[in-house]
């Protein structure tokens, strides 16, 4: 996280730390569900055990942790590697369901009415341990608030060299400021663009952290985040397809909107 | 002079009656006979709320018949006052007794509770009726347990702590 | 004529599960009775492990009612035990039977062993 | 639980011999309990139910007897079949316990 500050305990008690190669995020649904960026939970998807997934906690290093495993990692079926970020988004089951308390609590989905929330110039808020601008991955989790940019704005902003003309598409949405100094970096990948619901007074995830320019926080660019309302059918068919239900048995997985992948991950954290 | 016609011998045969059976507790016996001969059967049926058991074990219907010996060839079932057994336990949650401590048996009612702040109920109110089917059943016909949402989007931000 | 058949893997690992289905023949399991697994250990007696009801209500041995589940699939006129958690110990031979043993399956013999 | 105890585990006995097996449960259990008999490698097979009723087809030298705690399987004249280990069940209480069985061998 570029430009942020120290999050406190119950800040962000959705926030996931997934290990496996290197460090990526994700964000807790219900009690036995990751949301996270297929990139980051792609390249070691033959393997879902060897993710170590973390949460609980504030300290990226902390022996004090709540752990959950990987029972089955889903990738949209429309996600490509390495050709894009279009459909970066992957549910991670988990083996078991983890125990609800105030440093441990579910991001909600949002509801019909949520776009109200998340126009051009609605504050989200980004946390993670990835690189800060002193260059290091962060010990301590990190938080920066940042506005919505204007759609339009952000794909003139990824339309000059070195990126490829239609990177950003419309399930994808970005966050950041003109001047740049606010972002999130290499290592915040697939965590959750949270906002607040002002009627209901819950957060809900709007975005998940998945690309951005090759300097975090550089001014004129922005981080781009997968647009998580476009996806909520994707979400829901595939947790009422697999069951709420972490029953640590695993069985064999169907194809059902989505790559199933008894898979762990090695990050690219793009973002 | 007498014909001789031999000897003529009449049988008559009274089948053994059956004991009177008389209906267990909580239960009528059907059809209602003045005796009951070979052959002939009764069955028991228990008022609302109240099983046929042999023992532990249920019974959905009980008919007996009269043996040539004149014993039935079933004993007699009791009308026992249906007990849906303990609750199961709620995950997250926990279950309060309603009609009194550890009180199981039909019409006894149980609520059903999430933890709170950080769970909440789904699917109905949580409160459970002893049907005389033998199970726990909700206001709304459900059988299956409520279930514990963890509840989402809790922040300290907006809290000021929990 | 009535008749049980159990079936299910002979060999399960310790800390699996052990999974077992009793087929039922020329009798339907929600017409009437209690429907039971019963254990016997090798050179040993006999132990009552639950049953499922007709109605689809289940009792089960309190020994073993923490790893035990019975459930049935009525299309299929069959009701199922599953064991978890098991060790050694749970080497058995198991039978399903009717109500209180008029009828009985010819047993399965579960080894369990790593 | 209720116990059955079974008495003797086993005897030595000859054809024609008239052979008694007894079963005393630690609580009342009615008449609610069956007898089995079962050879090596076979499923139990049901003699008796609800203390002394004879199933179909059980031959009449099998008969059932007790109710309460005490309770008794006689063999009226013993058969070369007849070898075999017998067990009680009460079923009349949760939860259903078996007696630990009686072995009846050839003398």
């Known amino acids: 996280i570029y430009g942020g500050q120290k999050a406190k305990p119950g800040d962000f008690p959705w926030q996931v730390l997934i290990l496996g190669g290197t460090t990526a995020a994700g964000a807790l649904l219900y009690d036995n569900w990751v949301l996270t960026a297929a990139h980051a939970v792609y390249e070691q998807k033959h393997d879902a055990s060897a993710l170590d997934i973390r949460m609980g906690t504030l300290k990226r290093l902390s022996p004090h942790y709540t752990q959950a495993w990987s029972e089955a990692v889903f990738i949209h079926e429309g996600y490509t590697h390495d050709a894009g970020f279009d459909n970066d988004i992957a549910l991670i089951k988990l083996n078991n369901k983890v125990v609800i308390n105030s440093n441990i609590t579910p991001i909600c989905l949002p509801r019909k009415e949520a776009e109200s929330f998340m126009r051009t110039d609605d504050i989200g808020t980004a946390s993670g341990w990835g690189l800060t601008q002193r260059g290091f991955l962060a010990r301590n989790l990190m938080y920066v608030d940042i506005p919505i940019v204007d759609h339009q704005k952000c794909t003139a902003a990824y339309e000059k060299p070195p990126y490829p003309r239609g990177s950003v598409t419309a399930n994808m949405l970005c966050a950041g400021l003109e001047s740049g100094g606010k972002d999130s970096c290499r290592g915040d990948s697939g965590g959750a663009l949270v906002f607040l619901d002002s009627e209901t007074e819950r957060w809900f995830v709007g975005g998940i952290v998945s690309w951005g320019s090759m300097n975090c926080g550089e001014a004129g660019q922005y981080g781009v985040y997968t647009k998580v309302i476009n996806y909520i059918p994707w979400i829901e068919n595939i947790i009422s397809d697999f069951g709420g239900g972490g029953s640590g048995g695993g069985g064999s997985a169907k194809f059902v909107a989505a790559w199933t992948l008894k898979a762990a991950a090695h990050h690219h954290h793009h973002h | 002079m007498a014909s001789m016609t031999g000897w003529k011998i009449h049988y008559t045969s009274t089948a053994h009656a059956c004991p009177y059976p008389m209906a267990p507790p909580n239960g009528h016996v059907s059809p209602v006979q003045a005796k009951y001969i070979l052959k002939d059967s009764f069955s028991i049926f228990c008022e609302t709320g109240y099983e046929l058991l042999q023992g532990h074990l249920p019974l959905k219907s009980f008919t007996a018949v009269c043996q040539k010996d004149g014993s039935w060839d079933r004993p007699m079932p009791a009308c026992s006052i249906v007990d849906c057994g303990p609750p199961d336990d709620l995950p997250s949650g926990r279950v309060e007794y309603i009609t009194g401590p550890g009180v199981t048996t039909y019409k006894a009612v149980i609520q059903y509770s999430c933890e709170e702040t950080f769970y909440t109920m789904k699917v109905n109110d949580g409160k459970y009726v002893c049907e005389a089917d033998g199970f726990w059943t909700s206001s709304k016909g459900e059988k299956s347990l409520p279930v514990c949402e963890p509840v989402c989007g809790l922040s300290a931000r907006t809290t000021g702590g929990r | 004529q009535v008749q049980l058949q159990e079936s299910g893997p002979g060999l399960v690992k310790p800390s699996q599960t052990l999974s077992l289905t009793c087929t039922v023949s020329?009798?339907?399991?929600?017409?009437?009775?209690?429907w039971n697994w019963i254990r016997q250990p090798p050179g040993k007696g006999l132990e009552w492990i639950g049953y499922?009801?007709?109605?689809?209500?289940?009792s089960y041995n309190p020994s073993l009612k923490s790893r035990v589940t019975i459930s049935r699939d009525t299309s299929k006129n069959q009701f199922s035990l599953k064991l978890s958690s098991v060790t050694a110990a749970d080497t058995a031979v198991y039978y399903c039977a009717r109500y209180w043993g008029d009828y009985w399956g010819q047993g399965t013999l579960v080894t369990v062993s790593s | 639980d209720i116990q059955m105890t079974q008495s003797p585990s086993s005897l030595s006995a000859s054809v024609g011999d008239r052979v008694t097996i007894t079963c005393k449960a630690s609580q009342n259990v009615g008449s609610n309990v069956a007898w089995f008999q079962q050879k090596p490698g076979k499923a139990p097979k049901p003699l008796i139910y609800s203390a002394s009723y004879r199933y179909s087809g059980v031959p009449s030298r099998f008969s059932g007897s007790g109710s309460g705690t005490d309770f008794t399987l006689t063999i009226s004249s013993l058969q070369p079949e007849d070898f075999a280990t017998y067990f009680c069940?009460?079923?009349?209480?949760?939860?259903?316990?078996f007696g630990g069985g009686t072995k009846v061998e050839i003398k």
């Open positions: 069940h009460q079923y009349n209480t949760y939860p259903l316990t």
């Open positions: 020329g009798y339907s399991i929600t017409s009437d009775y209690a």
């Open positions: 499922i009801s007709y109605s689809g209500r289940t």
